[in-house]
Interface confidence: low
């Protein structure tokens, strides 16, 4: 229904507090430079005035829609192009165009310094001077670092920083309380930054159409009992909810997301029977859970696939009445069947059907040519199989940062045009997949590597697209989302590229790294070790073995010398010369 | 354990006030900014009002300013929100919790104003 004002509609569904915070990281996804003070400050501006919008919707400007409004509070800031640069353009233009050259701007690599997690008792102090403060800085410097980060679901992560906080500031030991606690909501957080940037790549290059295909999927494994109908409508509101936050219409967003979950516990019985521990909770953790609620139980009298898709007279006909609906029921009969695929998959195999069925049906005997369709998906459901197997026993032989190094290697030799510290963050992650997945049961590890892979590996476009250097990544980059993925595991080394000259101090240390923790440390030996990859792609693994374990042994001696200094420049020299033997 | 447990609700005539209660255990309570947050049938949580650990600072939405005083007794560990001149737009479950959050994490007590 049509609102008198579309601000008073959202303050009043939304509420104050969850209205603040969505608005302030909608800002802070768009100016990403602005100090939180700057964003606050606005913020309260348009609290104000959606206040007084409730009071009289017609007021002055209650009636302009939300990006009208947020547009003209960020377009008013000062500085704006001495800041910004070309983004000051943007306000050139007029609604629509200016909230998409708003989007166009957005840096998925913004030049920040890491958020530095601050050291316990500070945090506990700072947490109960103003706990709404210390959260709102909280959503700016996650919303600045991950321009589309999914909005209700940060303000789930800073309410779970709220309860650990709580609970931990009012221990003796605040630190150990503190420490792996946060560790996880950050992890966690950053998994699902990643999925959500995915989702919007998939919603931006491939449109609607390609997001609801993922969800219908997605929805159909976890409720195997719900009919088709109920999925696609399930699929329909998700996709408005994800195209809103996408596009940065957070409020919406949120106010939709909180809609379906209510749509979803009042539905339970025809849904799915795994929903009532969720729907008991409040807003943000019942949408939260809903999200990652486990798999329904899988009727058991569902009929073989061929029946309807395969060996009915009528598939031509049913494929030529209604394409998407057709096709959309495979997806759905064949997802419900298959919680142990991944969605990426799913949906290649959804691709498979419709071209088979393309091609078939224009031919004289159309069964006769479709009718080995199902045989013909064996080989794309061995590739990721065998993948997982290999990546695991991979994992499970080197542990994570080893088997991160093996990744880093290999991804080297593929791209060895792309920047160092792109592949050592994209290895780091891609790596992580081991302790994320492989520790799962044999028929969860699938979907697990392969969605979260597909994750990974869209960031790593998304900043290629920025400096495109290799021809290797461009390749699989170009490609549908779900056929990007096996298009990475098969390239081999780049044999166009000409090797680095080997430079002395590249691989020269000072006693700085002893005092650095450990991840840091570790990612400066990445980093020397695509340097070397870079420097001789065709190193054998046994090479590229001996350099490190040296390089390792050499920390190790100086980090406990008495006199750390003079062993590094001592030392160090020597080591060069033996990584370069090694290498010859 | 944390425990939160509000009282002090009740059924009111549009004009006269109430005086709600929350005795906080399990936590340091002095150490804790503390909230009241309301939620009206069919609506979602809306936050009413925070003061800080010292009891120094206090903040209201403006639906409540001027009407409704947050106080709290450290020595007792209890938060109190004493309401005026109640409407019958107060009407709503009104619950406390630590810090900012929405989060409902106690039973709450109802407010009705009605004549």
């Known amino acids: 229904e049509a609102h008198k004002s579309e601000i008073a509609h959202r303050y009043n569904d939304l509420g104050e507090q969850h209205f603040k915070g969505l608005v302030l990281i909608a800002f802070s996804q768009y100016l990403q430079k602005c100090s939180y003070d700057e964003h606050a400050k606005l913020v309260q501006e348009v609290t104000d005035f959606a206040k007084t919008c409730v009071a009289d919707e017609s007021a002055a400007n209650c009636d302009k829609s939300l990006h009208t409004l947020f547009g003209d509070k960020l377009c008013a800031i000062p500085n704006l192009r001495e800041n910004y640069g070309e983004l000051a353009d943007c306000c050139t233009k007029q609604e629509p165009e200016r909230n998409e050259c708003f989007l166009q701007h957005k840096d998925d690599n913004p030049s920040l310094p890491p958020f530095e997690r601050p050291e316990a008792e500070a945090m506990c102090t700072s947490f109960k001077e103003n706990p709404t403060t210390f959260m709102g800085h909280y959503l700016h410097e996650v919303a600045r670092r991950h321009p589309y980060f999914y909005a209700p679901e940060l303000l789930y992560y800073a309410e779970q920083y709220n309860e650990i906080l709580t609970q931990c500031c009012a221990e003796a030991d605040k630190e150990s309380c503190l420490t792996p606690k946060l560790d996880g909501v950050k992890e966690k957080a950053l998994v699902s930054s990643v999925r959500q940037r995915m989702k919007c790549s998939s919603m931006q290059k491939f449109g609607e159409r390609a997001f609801k295909a993922w969800a219908v999927a997605r929805l159909s494994q976890t409720f195997p009992n719900a009919d088709f109908a109920e999925i696609t409508k399930l699929a329909t509101d998700l996709t408005k909810v994800n195209k809103e936050c996408c596009h940065g219409d957070l409020l919406e967003c949120a106010d939709d997301r909180a809609e379906l979950a209510k749509y979803m516990c009042e539905n339970q019985a025809t849904i799915s029977s795994k929903l009532q521990t969720c729907c008991d909770k409040p807003l943000l953790k019942k949408a939260h859970c809903l999200s990652e609620v486990e798999h329904d139980t899988m009727p058991a009298d569902l009929p073989a696939i061929a029946a309807d898709f395969v060996e009915d007279q009528e598939v031509c006909k049913n494929y030529a009445e209604a394409k998407d609906v057709f096709l959309g029921t495979f997806l759905y009969e064949y997802s419900r069947r298959h919680p142990d695929y991944s969605v990426s998959l799913l949906l290649r195999l959804a691709k498979k059907y419709e071209a088979t069925l393309e091609k078939c049906c224009a031919e004289a005997n159309p069964p006769a040519c479709y009718g080995t369709v199902l045989a013909e998906f064996q080989p794309l459901v061995e590739e990721p199989k065998n993948l997982v197997k290999t990546n695991c026993d991979l994992y499970e032989k080197l542990g994570e940062y080893g088997f991160q190094n093996a990744i880093l290697v290999r991804y080297t030799q593929k791209a060895p045009q792309v920047s160092t510290p792109t592949l050592v963050e994209a290895a780091r992650n891609l790596g992580r997949v081991g302790t994320k997945c492989c520790t799962l049961p044999e028929d969860q590890r699938l979907p697990c590597v392969e969605d979260y892979l597909s994750a990974i590996l869209n960031r790593v476009c998304l900043l290629h697209e920025k400096t495109p250097v290799s021809e290797h990544v461009t390749k699989c980059c170009s490609g549908s989302l779900v056929e990007r993925r096996p298009c990475f595991s098969a390239l081999t080394v780049d044999e166009t590229y000409v090797p680095k000259e080997f430079k002395a101090e590249t691989f020269t240390f000072h006693s700085d790294i002893c005092t650095l923790p450990e991840k840091e440390k570790q990612i400066k030996k990445q980093t020397a070790l695509a340097e070397l990859v870079k420097h001789k792609p065709k190193a054998t693994a046994e090479q590229l073995k001996t350099v490190m374990d040296d390089f390792a042994q050499f920390l190790d001696t100086c980090c406990k010398a008495a006199d750390k200094d003079t062993c590094f420049s001592t030392e160090g020299p020597n080591l060069v010369t033996r990584c370069k033997d090694a290498l010859a | 354990e944390v425990q939160l447990v509000e009282s002090g609700g009740g059924l009111v005539q549009p004009g006269n006030s109430l005086r709600l209660s929350c005795a906080a255990s399990?936590?340091?309570?002095?150490?804790?900014?503390m909230s009241w947050v309301r939620q009206a049938p069919g609506k979602g949580p809306e936050w009413v009002s925070s003061?800080?650990?010292?009891?120094?600072?206090?903040l209201y939405a403006d639906s409540v300013k001027g009407r409704f005083t947050i106080s709290r007794d450290n020595a007792k560990t209890t938060l109190y929100l004493q309401m005026n001149s109640l409407r019958p737009e107060d009407t709503a479950v009104y619950y406390c919790?630590?810090?900012?959050?929405?989060?409902?994490s106690s039973q709450g007590t109802l407010v009705t104003v009605s004549s």
């Open positions: 003061i800080s650990g010292s009891g120094h600072d206090t």
């Open positions: 399990g936590f340091t309570f002095s150490s804790f900014g």
């Open positions: 919790t630590i810090g900012g959050s929405l989060t409902r």
